[in-house]
């Protein structure tokens, strides 16, 4: 399962985390900083 950086047009998509591209799934994914969740790491749950 390979991952790469998201394309530049995804800049700012992940609000509190790192945008990665899951190659096998053809999907952008936000790897959230701890304390954040949600598809775009938009929700602070602490």
């Amino acid at each position: 399962v390979s991952i790469t950086k998201c394309s530049s047009d995804m800049n700012g998509y992940c609000l509190h985390g790192q945008c990665i591209y899951l190659v096998d799934m053809s999907q952008n994914y936000c790897r959230c900083e701890v304390g954040y969740t949600g598809v775009r790491c938009e929700h602070f749950f602490l």
Epitope: Y29, R31, V34, T37, V39, H43
Partner: antibody, heavy 118, light 108 residues
């Protein structure tokens, strides 16, 4: 296929510590955070905490601070949870679970049964 | 912490019957962060419904979920034998994350 393989059942004496493991396979381990959950007859499911497999940071349920310590070894795609100063109250099944896209716990390990008895 | 109260604790239903169980939160939970898990004896919990109303992969269409704020529910339109299990609601809105005590669904 995504799998979380946990270490085997443990029978330990009160007062000691135990470290249980959760090995991820079938996916890129450092993409998804891992949670630990306790299941006992008395209290159903209890969230212990979550650890970022990439950053290494952890957040604990206040109730388990000082009791549980979560760590990650990225090189072996394995998460660990150490439980300290064990008492009979710690006897339970402990699960690791992967946090999916968005936040549901989409894959769970098979569970590690911990029995604390003298 | 957010307390999730599930009712009923135990229920039984006949084949083909419509089943509804509820999950009431002690304070408001965003519908995006309310999930349901199914657990059968001797097995791990399985993600069943996520973000209130989305069925997890492989979950039959007879299941549905709804709700908002403090009141959520899981419904089975036509009970089947394989649906016998314990269902837990779970919130990821505020730390500590919490689970309900479960609704055990039995076949009558």
């Amino acid at each position: 296929q995504v799998q979380l393989q946990q270490s085997g059942a443990e029978l330990v004496r009160p007062g000691v510590s135990v470290k249980i493991s959760c090995k991820g396979s079938g996916y890129t381990f450092t993409v998804y955070s891992l949670h630990w959950v306790k299941q006992s007859h008395a209290r159903s499911l209890e969230w212990i905490g979550v650890i970022s497999t990439y950053y290494g940071d952890a957040i604990y349920n206040q109730k388990f601070k000082g009791k549980a310590t979560m760590t990650v070894d990225k090189s072996s795609s394995t998460a660990y949870m150490e439980l300290a100063r064990l008492t009979s109250e710690d006897s339970a099944i402990y699960y690791c679970a992967r946090e999916g896209n968005g936040n549901p716990l989409d894959y769970w390990g098979q569970g590690t049964t911990l029995t604390v008895s003298s | 912490q957010i307390v999730l109260t599930q009712s009923p604790a135990i229920m039984s239903a006949s084949l083909g019957e419509r089943v509804t169980m509820t999950c009431t939160a002690s304070s408001s939970v965003s519908s995006s962060y309310l999930h349901w898990y199914q657990q059968k004896p001797g097995s791990s919990p399985k993600l069943w419904i996520y973000s209130t109303s989305n069925l997890a992969s492989g979950v039959p269409a007879r299941f549905s979920g709804s709700g908002s704020g403090t009141s959520y529910s899981l419904t089975i339109t036509n009970m089947e034998a394989e649906d016998s299990a314990t269902y837990y609601c779970h919130q990821y809105h505020r730390s500590p994350l919490t689970f309900g005590a479960g609704t055990k669904l039995e076949l009558k």
